[in-house]
């Protein structure tokens, strides 16, 4: 059979299985690709969408790896990505978006690596990724690159429906801290990259998580700004113990100014200040609970008093209620004046 | 990481078939392209052919007349058979992995066997 | 077929020195093109894959260059280990052909 052809502006080879679109200003995705492509690159073009069938089999039943980083992508549309049955790869890095479909994939897809490096700077395009991800469309997805997205928070439970995931890397966002991830679910995760983001401390419930996790081998946490008070004791604990942390002795603090650079692996109990007021939101926890213990106590004292008094108070009770029941009495005769119209004057001139 | 390991006859004389196997470990069969290279004593790398994981094949035609290369995805084996061999067919063989898709991956031959020297004498 | 042609067959360096090897093709291979080093006793070892990429574990003083028809493998600053036989493969059609070899030797 004659070779299949190659689309005007591209390179194609079909012992490489590769088609190559590079920089060739495309404002769509050619039509013509030959069906023998497992490799298809089309980069550094105009796309600006990627609209329900624009790629799509059977002409592009092989297709396994699909590289479509820096074509100005601003959407990514329902069934867009759908109908690839042997896509394991795709690369969107470096596109704006501001929309991905949480539909662009199907229901269910066999993509086993997703890289969106630099694409998830706007947060429709996050929670679209959130939705498609906890959607479950994604469930053989094994390595997942989020890195520089300047992602200051992941949307809650993002994580949840992803079984298959070895490789995890968010780094170079802004990350402060990992309270609402949730890793539980990622039973074979096997590297983490968490470098260079803002995270100040990482909190018992994230590391008993890691702990947790049988395969996770690879942690990588340099250039953090670590805050080395009170509340970084237990991730130190942690830290010196681990055996999951790449490149821990390089680790340093950025704040308190005092404490910076200093190596977090070196630090001492005694020198994280941790009988100072620091991290506010425990520190209240604690106060109000000293003054809970305060309150019960000056309460069981009130009650203790009371009842080794209790036939004094009985007696002032019973004083009480005569004083009470004659001041009663003289409200009831002075109604009593008043009600009947004979006695009116005399009420009016008398002190009764 | 995928890793190649091979075996057969070193020692044939002229007219007889050359056969090698190559075991796949630490890795799927889908993915890959297995070939065979060659390399005559003292001079440069010869491709011979290539198998995918479906069984499609592709010879170098100066051998296409004496080559078959086989898969057995049951045993993770691929094997090359080379039909009436004579003296120039002595050279070091070589099995290799090319991955035919892109991404953290190689683009090339990316993981060869440990070599099998064949010696072809009467 | 398509035939590659390196140059030079032989290259005298010593270490520390810069080493730019030369691989043409008979005719255009668009960027699929492999490098591959190989020492005395040894398999090939993929060096640079897609013309520039380097492979994984490569140093970086490991690079490509070129499209089309001509094709350049340098090392920026040669180590003791550097020097062995660089192949050049292309891989746009087939039959998938190798380069005759350069021999990276000390001076």
């Known amino acids: 059979q004659p070779p299949a052809a190659c689309p005007a502006p591209c390179e194609c080879s079909e012992a490489a299985k590769t088609v190559k679109c590079v920089n060739k200003n495309l404002t769509e995705v050619p039509p013509d690709l030959p069906p023998y492509v497992r490799n298809l690159f089309i980069t550094g073009n105009r796309l600006g969408r990627l609209p329900a069938g624009a790629l799509s089999a059977p002409r592009l039943a092989e297709l396994g790896s699909l590289n479509l980083s820096g074509n100005h992508l601003r959407a990514v549309e329902a069934g867009a990505l759908a109908a690839l049955p042997a896509l394991r790869q795709l690369d969107l890095g470096g596109n704006p978006l501001a929309e991905l479909s949480p539909l662009a994939f199907g229901r269910a897809s066999p993509l086993e690596e997703l890289a969106l490096r630099g694409a998830l700077r706007e947060q429709g395009a996050l929670l679209g990724l959130a939705d498609l991800l906890q959607a479950g469309a994604l469930r053989n997805l094994s390595r997942l690159e989020l890195a520089d997205n300047g992602l200051l928070l992941l949307p809650t439970g993002m994580l949840g429906a992803l079984p298959a995931l070895r490789h995890l890397d968010l780094s170079n966002n802004s990350l402060v801290g990992l309270r609402n991830v949730s890793f539980q679910g990622l039973v074979r995760l096997q590297s983490l990259n968490l470098s260079d983001n803002s995270l100040g401390v990482l909190r018992n419930g994230t590391l008993a998580q890691w702990r947790g996790l049988p395969a996770l081998r690879r942690i990588s946490l340099s250039h953090n700004t670590w805050v080395c008070d009170c509340a970084i004791e237990d991730m130190v604990a942690w830290l010196k113990e681990s055996d999951q942390v790449e490149g821990k002795e390089a680790l340093s603090c950025a704040f308190p100014e005092k404490m910076a650079g200093r190596a977090l692996l070196k630090l001492n109990t005694s020198e994280l200040n941790c009988s100072a007021p620091v991290d506010v939101p425990s520190q209240l926890q604690t106060s109000y609970v000293f003054l809970g213990i305060v309150l019960a106590l000056i309460g069981a004292i009130f009650l203790l008093v009371l009842y080794l008094n209790r036939k004094g108070i009985k007696k002032w009770m019973h004083n009480i209620r005569d004083a009470c029941r004659d001041h009663m009495e003289g409200y009831h005769y002075r109604y009593e004046i008043n009600a009947d119209p004979r006695l009116t004057n005399l009420s009016s001139n008398s002190d009764v | 990481q995928v890793q190649l390991q091979q075996w057969g006859a070193g020692l044939l004389k002229p007219s007889e078939t050359l056969s090698l196997t190559c075991a796949v470990y630490g890795g799927s069969f889908s993915g890959y392209y297995w070939s065979w290279i060659r390399q005559p004593p003292g001079k440069g790398l010869e491709w011979i052919g290539e198998?995918?994981?479906?069984?499609?094949?592709n010879y170098n035609p100066s051998l296409k007349s004496r080559v078959t290369i086989s898969v057995d995805t049951s045993k993770n084996q691929f094997s090359l058979k080379l039909s009436s061999v004579t003296a120039a067919d002595t050279a070091v063989y070589y099995c290799?992995?090319?991955?035919?898709?892109?991404?953290?991956?190689?683009?090339?031959?990316?993981?060869w066997g440990q070599g099998t020297t064949v010696t072809v004498s009467s | 077929e398509i035939v590659l042609t390196q140059s030079p067959a032989t290259l005298s360096l010593s270490p520390g020195e810069r080493a730019t090897l030369s691989c043409r093709a008979s005719?255009?291979?668009?960027?699929?093109l492999a490098w591959y080093q190989q020492k005395p006793g040894q398999a090939p070892r993929l060096l640079i894959y897609d013309a520039s990429n380097r492979a994984t574990g490569i140093p970086a003083r490991f690079s490509g260059s070129g499209s089309g028809t001509d094709f350049t493998l340098t090392i920026s600053s040669l180590e003791p280990e550097d020097f062995a036989v660089y192949y050049c493969?292309?891989?746009?059609?087939?039959?998938?052909?190798f380069g005759q070899g350069t021999r990276l030797e000390i001076k």
């Open positions: 198998i995918d994981h479906s069984g499609s094949t």
């Open positions: 290799a992995a090319w991955f035919g898709e892109l991404w953290d991956y190689y683009y090339g031959m990316d993981v």
């Open positions: 005719q255009s291979v668009s960027s699929f």
């Open positions: 493969q292309q891989r746009s059609n087939w039959p998938l052909t």
